[in-house]
């Protein structure tokens, strides 16, 4: 059943003498494996023998034996699906039909494949896109209906016989659907590629030429133009004539329209290849080009810069920058339309020529107020001298100048006075808009630039003002020189350095922090009594009687100031001790008697000791010695000793007499 055999392979294979053929082939024999395979060349069926006649190129049998002369032809297939064949080398007389005679256990089949072998390598075929346009990337394809594993080939692209720089991508196909070698070249043609010869060259593995295909490129492009001008330098004077000619060096397809443009704008009624400009004016200066269009689009020539020369026009001055800040740099630019450009300039400041200034720009590195004013200029070129334009005003701004702080009061100023100051300046641009004062205080500014200080303080030493426009300028501080009575008067002990003991030499100093004016007088006073007029009060040997409250006064022409009362304390050992007895020095037995040790001491007595008439110390240490009940035996002389941090003192003897009570006398 012949329908069971299914083959797939290329219908025709192409090669040339000495090359090889690789025949990709697959089959399916549904009733089992292949048992016999014969490759015929131009097979013909013999009805008599019911067999095929023809040259047997290859034969394989059940036992798998292959005659040795069949090495040129190889069956690379298998027994059930692959029927790939190779003929290497292939010869011219191999052209024709190849017959694949297949036999399985029960079925037979003859499959035919066409083989076309040429005498010489056949040329590849260049495939071009239907249209090639400049600057648009295209792919050129070179196709060769040949590929064989045993015969490597290469396809090379040439432009005008020179290998093309662009990299080509080569691919091969050896499948049951197709056998080919293909090279694809991507490139962006320019207009100059139009008419140029592109070749795809087939070479063997060693680069030897085998065959080629050639095409001449048809590259569609916008018109390519050349512009010519008379005079050739395109420099004329007003009133001259100019001719411009537009030449089309290449256009594909043919051009259709011509126009002329000046500075990018189309010139009306100028549609020929020649542009005639008669009696040109300076307004006709500019960039000219011609534009020619075809179906691809418009092409433009290079621009011709037509320069119509004329004497300078009235000039204007541009200032960078006005207003200018004093000390900054300023540049003046003289602007005058002229062709050729001016070669010489004359500059004027407030109508007076500025010597040595002949350039287009004037640069002043450090602007001063006197630079202000009107600047104008005159430009000059080979065709003449221009007129002086209106000029430009330079405004020089600067901080207020020569600022001073002025005291309006009569001098001297006394503490507590009301002081008025004014802030003055010499000049300012822009005008002064505000004033500042240092130091800051809760002061009144009755008018701009005037400061009123009510009840001026003794310590208001200096005041400075600033006059401000865009900047503030400070005056040097002015001294108020406020006069005041001596301040911070106080008594200070100079010696001794430690506490004052009776008998010490003592010096007291009358101190003050400040006084204006400086000339002062001193006064010492104790309990309202004047003690001295020096700054120091001295005691050669201080006594407790000198203790007390002292004050010193310092006065100047403005007034006098007293110190706080200062207490002078003299330390001394207990003195003037005496024993006083209560209720008296004669007490009845059985009653209570209190002895008190009285003393004068600084600091007060801290410790008392009592003694009897035998100088025997008693076990009592307080100021009072209480005897209760008193006995006759208590009669006798007593004395006490007082102790403080300075020393000790003792009292004289005091006699206590204890007499018998009437009861005792009565018993006796």
């Amino acid at each position: 059943d012949s329908s069971k055999w299914v083959f797939e392979h290329p219908e025709t294979l192409y090669a040339w003498e000495g090359a090889c053929v690789w025949i990709p082939c697959t089959y399916r024999a549904l009733d089992g494996d292949l048992e016999s395979f014969i490759l015929f060349h131009n097979p013909e069926y013999n009805k008599n023998t019911s067999k095929f006649d023809g040259t047997r190129l290859y034969e394989s049998t059940k036992d798998g034996k292959v005659p040795s002369e069949q090495k040129r032809v190889q069956f690379l297939g298998d027994k059930n699906k692959n029927c790939t064949l190779s003929i290497h080398p292939v010869h011219l007389n191999d052209s024709g039909q190849l017959g694949l005679r297949m036999e399985s256990k029960t079925e037979k089949w003859m499959e035919r494949i066409h083989l076309n072998v040429s005498e010489r390598p056949f040329p590849p075929h260049i495939q071009l896109p239907p249209e090639i346009q400049e600057s648009q990337e295209v792919t050129l394809t070179c196709l060769l209906n040949f590929s064989c594993y045993g015969y490597p080939i290469q396809l090379q692209w040439l432009l005008e016989g020179v290998p093309m720089r662009q990299a080509a991508v080569t691919s091969t196909s050896l499948t049951i659907k197709s056998v080919f070698t293909r090279s694809e070249l991507k490139f962006s043609p320019q207009w100059s590629h139009h008419g140029k010869i592109v070749t795809c060259q087939l070479q063997d593995a060693d680069g030897k030429f085998l065959s080629n295909d050639t095409v001449q490129l048809n590259v569609k492009h916008t018109p390519k133009l050349e512009i010519k001008v008379t005079p050739s330098d395109a420099i004329v004077r007003e009133g001259d004539s100019v001719t411009m000619t537009c030449e089309v060096s290449s256009s594909n397809p043919e051009y259709t329209t011509v126009s002329w443009l000046k500075d990018g704008t189309s010139l009306k009624k100028q549609n020929t290849f020649t542009l005639n400009l008669r009696e040109v004016t300076k307004d006709q200066s500019g960039k000219y080009c011609c534009q020619v269009s075809n179906d691809v689009g418009p092409g433009r020539s290079e621009e011709v810069f037509l320069q119509v020369q004329y004497a300078p026009e009235p000039s204007t001055v541009q200032i960078l920058h006005s207003p200018a800040v004093e000390g900054s740099q300023v540049e003046f630019l003289c602007m005058s339309l002229a062709n050729p450009l001016p070669t010489n300039y004359t500059w004027y400041h407030n109508g007076k020529e500025m010597q040595g200034r002949t350039e287009e720009k004037v640069h002043i590195p450090k602007i001063l107020p006197w630079h202000a004013g009107t600047y104008s200029c005159v430009a000059e070129n080979i065709l003449g001298t221009g007129q002086r334009g209106p000029g430009a005003e330079l405004d020089v701004q600067y901080p207020p100048k020569k600022v001073t702080t002025v005291i309006q009061n009569p001098m001297p100023i006394r503490e507590g006075d009301t002081v008025t100051l004014s802030c003055n300046y010499n000049s300012s641009n822009p005008s002064v808009t505000r004033y500042e004062w240092k130091p800051h205080g809760a002061w009144e500014e009755p008018s701009l630039g005037v400061l009123k200080i009510q009840n001026v303080g003794w310590d208001n030493t200096t005041i400075a003002c600033a006059a401000c426009n865009s900047w503030c300028s400070w005056a040097s501080p002015v001294a108020l020189n406020v006069q005041y009575a001596p301040r911070d008067v106080r008594v200070r002990k100079i010696k001794p350095l430690s506490e004052i003991h009776s008998g010490n030499s003592v010096s007291l100093q009358c101190d003050f922090s400040s006084s204006h004016p400086k000339e002062v007088q001193f006064f010492w006073e104790k309990n309202g009594r004047l003690l001295g007029k020096e700054s120091q009060l001295n005691f050669d040997s201080i006594s407790p009687e000198d203790a007390g409250s002292y004050s010193c006064w310092v006065n100047n022409s403005i007034g006098q100031t007293a110190s706080k009362a200062w207490t002078l304390e003299v330390l001394y050992a207990p003195r003037r001790l005496r024993v006083s007895m209560s209720p008296g020095d004669q007490v009845m037995e059985g009653k209570s008697a209190t002895l008190t040790c009285e003393s004068d001491a600084n600091p007060p007595v801290s410790h008392y000791t009592w003694f009897d008439w035998n100088n025997q110390s008693l076990p009592y240490h307080s100021q009072k010695l209480r005897l209760e009940p008193v006995k006759v035996q208590h009669s006798g002389a007593y004395w006490c000793q007082g102790t403080n941090s300075v020393g000790k003192g003792r009292s004289p003897l005091s006699t206590l007499t204890v007499y018998y009570s009437p009861e005792t006398i009565g018993r006796r």
């Epitope: 005008e160 100059s192 139009h194 140029k196 010869i197 295909d213 001449q216 060096s249």
Partner: antibody
């Protein structure tokens, strides 16, 4: 080898048309453009135009625009140049020619 | 189109002389893709088709005697016969083939 063989001499009346042929051999006809050039007696060579036989694309010198038609027959590898509205100043030798990469091939005229 | 101007328009010389013809192009004929000038020189004798002598401005065609040479680039080209021979009497044309074809006046 490359050969370009042209048709013979023609005599025409003013206002008539003429069609000159150029048979190419020795190369792939569609690979190269075929140009036409003429030369009047004692005058310079003057390019008329070309045809690209691959796609029948033509380009003409503007001075012949509207009077000249160049065609090609791929089957016979022959190019034709037809000039209409003939004037006496069209009297000239007409050449077909083509480029090679380095050389140029000319018909006999 | 690109215009070519040849000079001189005619000249007389003796056998053995060195002869120079110039050809000026209105635009450059240098094809930058291959760095070659698309200018050719032809010799034409009466009743004959033009014969190619030089292509690419300076390359001699096969079989052309070495006394013929060409030089130049861009827009200015020179054709030289180093030692004139009697059979060199002819009209010589320059031709540009960068963009269509144009010929010098010969």
């Amino acid at each position: 080898q490359v050969q370009l063989v042209q048709s013979g001499a023609e005599v025409k009346k003013p206002g008539a048309s003429v069609k000159v042929s150029c048979k190419a051999s020795g190369y792939v006809f569609t690979s190269y453009w075929l140009h036409w050039v003429r030369q009047a007696r004692g005058q310079r060579l003057e390019w008329i135009g070309y045809i690209n036989p691959r796609n029948d694309y033509t380009e003409y010198n503007r001075i012949f625009k509207g009077r000249v038609t160049i065609t090609a027959d791929k089957s016979t590898s022959t190019a034709y140049m037809e000039l209409s509205s003939l004037r006496s100043e069209d009297t000239a030798v007409y050449y077909c020619a083509r480029r090679g990469i380095t050389t140029f091939y000319w018909g006999q005229g | 189109a690109i215009q070519l101007t040849q000079s001189p328009s005619s000249l007389s010389a003796s056998v053995g002389d060195r002869v120079t013809i110039t050809c000026k192009s209105s635009q450059s004929v240098l094809y930058s893709a291959v760095e070659k000038n698309y200018l050719a020189w032809y010799q034409q004798k009466p009743g004959k088709a033009p014969k190619l002598l030089i292509y690419w401005a300076s390359t001699r065609e096969r079989g052309v005697p070495s006394r013929f040479s060409g030089s130049g680039s861009g827009t200015d080209f020179t054709f030289t016969i180093s030692s004139l021979e009697a059979e060199d009497a002819a009209t010589y044309y320059c031709k540009q083939y960068l963009s269509s074809w144009t010929f010098g006046q010969g």
